[in-house]
């Protein structure tokens, strides 16, 4: 058996998603993403499609990107149903009960499906060299896929904590999947770090009523910085501030505001920071992957930030207007998440209460493993 | 036709391990997810966790997380549950069982290993 | 987890006499996923109804079930001695799985 090239990513609707390299039927693959704390993702259009074809263009799998793969998702047609030709899923249909976005926008059928009215069938999504989505494909259910894609859904999400002075960020996702950039993070993300002098630093995400926040962080950086100033969340010097235009690209440290000059920053006057103790630049830097906006708030309640209502396990809503999906592992190429020895999930913030687990720890470091699962 | 055949009663003491086995027949058995359920006398069913013997992929019920082992066995279509650090409270019937075809109902269930620990 | 509390714990019925029982979920249970088992004492479970209302292979159409959402329930048409047994209900909407406390329909 290959090793899996686990990848997963989440998008500020509160969406994470994940893809799996594994040989396996239909139901097989449909129980794994609920024993993960998920289901059978759907891959509906928008925010949705994008974040799965990140996954799928972040890198081959087993494969080495030389044949062409078959994932299973949520899309089936049932016995009752007849093949459509002129839909756009060809009477195929979804298994969630939101009917998100337009199904017009959806991918091509690399095969027509064969006409009937009698036999379910289910459907895979081929991308081609592993990596590239070609389209929808129909497939039995019985039949060995070489992978599937899970989704999960978050009420709420914790904006990545801004490391200041930390250095050697990991994160671990409820999932058990490990990166080194994770711009949003669900409920029982733990993101470890070490300060200067080498202490190590830990910081979980929790829910509760208000939102997600990061416990045990204080103040709005991982670890301080022993000067004023920050650039994309990291500490950096007066001379480092300024982005190629001349602009002033820096946000001032806690206990500091900028100054008048608009490119300094100054002793806060009475001890009052302002956006929580970050002063405003006249400019920011653009957000990206790798470099979290700067003044974010938190924390984010999706429906409060995305003018949604509040999304739960059992919804599944999707945003389709963010241009940018965040993922995990972005910095650079996507990293092949791994899963480690030592991790456990935090009881009360997973997203369901059990989570996968490899034990033969034999093939290479990307092989999952000791996958533990934790019950709310 | 499809059978779970377990492995029989053990009497065990306080502090040891035990390990018992289910042998699937009649079907594919890397294709299948294996769950293992423990009852109580007198009480009702819980679940313990599951294993994929086609990648062994596992997933256990926090509860019983450091207390029960799964493993599985591809060349004899043999599941294995072992459980350490024994005390009365894991006086039970454990039984695996296992999907197939019934979105997700266990359809098919051993006959159950009976576990007794008596010091 | 998803707590499944199944109403009532003990219940006895006449032969011929309608029966009902309850299984309440803590949180919305997609009815793809909510089954009930039969056992019987010395038995392993049977898989008795599954996708909230679909009867297994074997089971008398005297049986059915019915809900949505966070409530679900077996009815028996017309009870029969061979009925007597525990009846436990189970969800796999969300992991871990869980069983209900089960109810025990004993003959009156």
């Known amino acids: 058996e290959h090793p899996t090239a686990d990848r997963a990513g989440c998008s500020a609707s509160g969406a994470c998603y994940s893809l799996h390299h594994a040989t396996m039927k239909r139901q097989a693959a449909e129980e794994a993403c609920i024993l993960r704390g998920g289901a059978l993702s759907t891959v509906r259009a928008g925010a949705e499609l994008r974040a799965v074809l990140a996954l799928l263009r972040a890198g081959p799998g087993p494969g080495g990107g030389s044949k062409d793969l078959l994932f299973w998702v949520a899309l089936e047609r049932r016995r009752s149903h007849c093949t459509l030709e002129n839909e756009p899923l060809r009477g195929f249909s979804w298994l969630s009960s939101d009917p998100g976005g337009l199904e017009s926008d959806t991918l091509q059928w690399v095969e027509e499906p064969q006409r009937s009215c009698t036999a379910r069938r289910c459907a895979v999504l081929q991308a081609t060299g592993g990596v590239e989505p070609a389209g929808w494909k129909e497939m039995r259910c019985h039949l060995r896929a070489n992978g599937y894609l899970c989704k999960y859904q978050f009420e709420v999400l914790c904006p990545a904590p801004r490391p200041g002075a930390a250095s050697n960020l990991s994160y671990r996702a409820p999932f058990q999947l490990h990166s080194a950039a994770l711009d949003f993070s669900p409920p029982g993300t733990e993101v470890s770090a070490l300060c200067r002098g080498q202490l190590p630093i830990s910081v979980t995400c929790i829910a509760d009523e208000i939102g997600a926040r990061w416990d045990k962080l204080s103040g709005d950086v991982l670890c301080p910085c022993p000067g004023r100033y920050l650039r994309a969340g990291k500490c950096a010097e007066l001379p480092n501030c300024l982005d190629d235009l001349g602009g002033f690209a820096c946000e001032c440290a806690t206990g500091f505001e900028l100054g008048k000059d608009g490119r300094s920053c100054v002793t806060s006057g009475e001890g009052q920071p302002t956006l929580g103790g970050t002063g405003v630049p006249t400019r920011r830097p653009p957000a990206t992957a790798t470099s979290p906006v700067p003044q974010r708030t938190w924390p984010i309640r999706v429906d409060e930030k995305l003018g949604e209502t509040p999304l739960v396990p059992e919804q599944d809503n999707s945003v389709t207007s963010i241009p940018e999906i965040p993922r995990w592992g972005s910095q650079s190429t996507m990293s092949t998440l791994q899963m480690s020895l030592q991790a456990e999930s935090k009881a009360t913030i997973t997203p369901s209460g059990s989570v996968i687990s490899k034990f033969n720890s034999t093939t290479s470091s990307a092989t999952p493993q000791a996958f533990d699962s934790s019950s709310a | 036709e499809v059978q779970l055949q377990q492995s029989g009663t053990v009497l065990a003491r306080p502090g040891a391990s035990v390990k018992m086995s289910c042998k699937a027949s009649?079907?594919?058995?890397?294709?299948?997810?294996m769950h293992w359920v423990k009852q109580r006398p007198g009480q009702g069913l819980e679940w313990i966790g599951a294993?994929?013997?086609?990648?062994?992929?596992?997933s256990y019920n926090q509860k019983f997380k450091g207390k029960a082992k799964l493993t599985a066995v591809t060349s004899t279509s043999t599941a294995y549950m072992e459980l350490s650090s024994l005390t009365n409270e894991d006086s039970a019937v454990f039984y695996c069982?296992?999907?197939?075809?019934?979105?997700?109902?266990?359809?098919?269930w051993g006959q159950g290993t009976s576990v007794t620990i008596s010091s | 987890q998803i707590v499944l509390t199944q109403s009532p714990a003990i219940m006895s019925a006449s032969l011929g006499e309608r029966v009902t029982m309850t299984c309440t979920a803590s949180?919305?249970?997609?009815?793809?996923?909510l089954h009930w088992y039969q056992q019987k004492p010395g038995s392993s479970p049977k898989l008795w109804i599954y996708?909230?209302?679909n009867l297994a292979s074997g089971v008398p159409a005297r049986f059915s079930g019915s809900g949505s959402g966070t409530s679900y329930s077996l009815t028996i048409s017309s009870m029969e001695a061979e009925d007597a047994a525990t009846y436990y209900c189970?969800?796999?909407?969300?992991?871990?799985?869980?069983f209900g406390g089960g109810t025990k329909l004993e003959i009156k």
């Open positions: 069982t296992h999907y197939y075809g019934s979105d997700y109902a266990m359809d098919y």
């Open positions: 009649g079907y594919t058995f890397t294709s299948y997810w």
């Open positions: 294993i994929y013997p086609g990648n062994s992929d596992t």
């Open positions: 949180s919305s249970v997609s009815s793809s996923y």
């Open positions: 996708s909230t209302s």
């Open positions: 189970h969800q796999y909407h969300r992991s871990p799985r869980t």
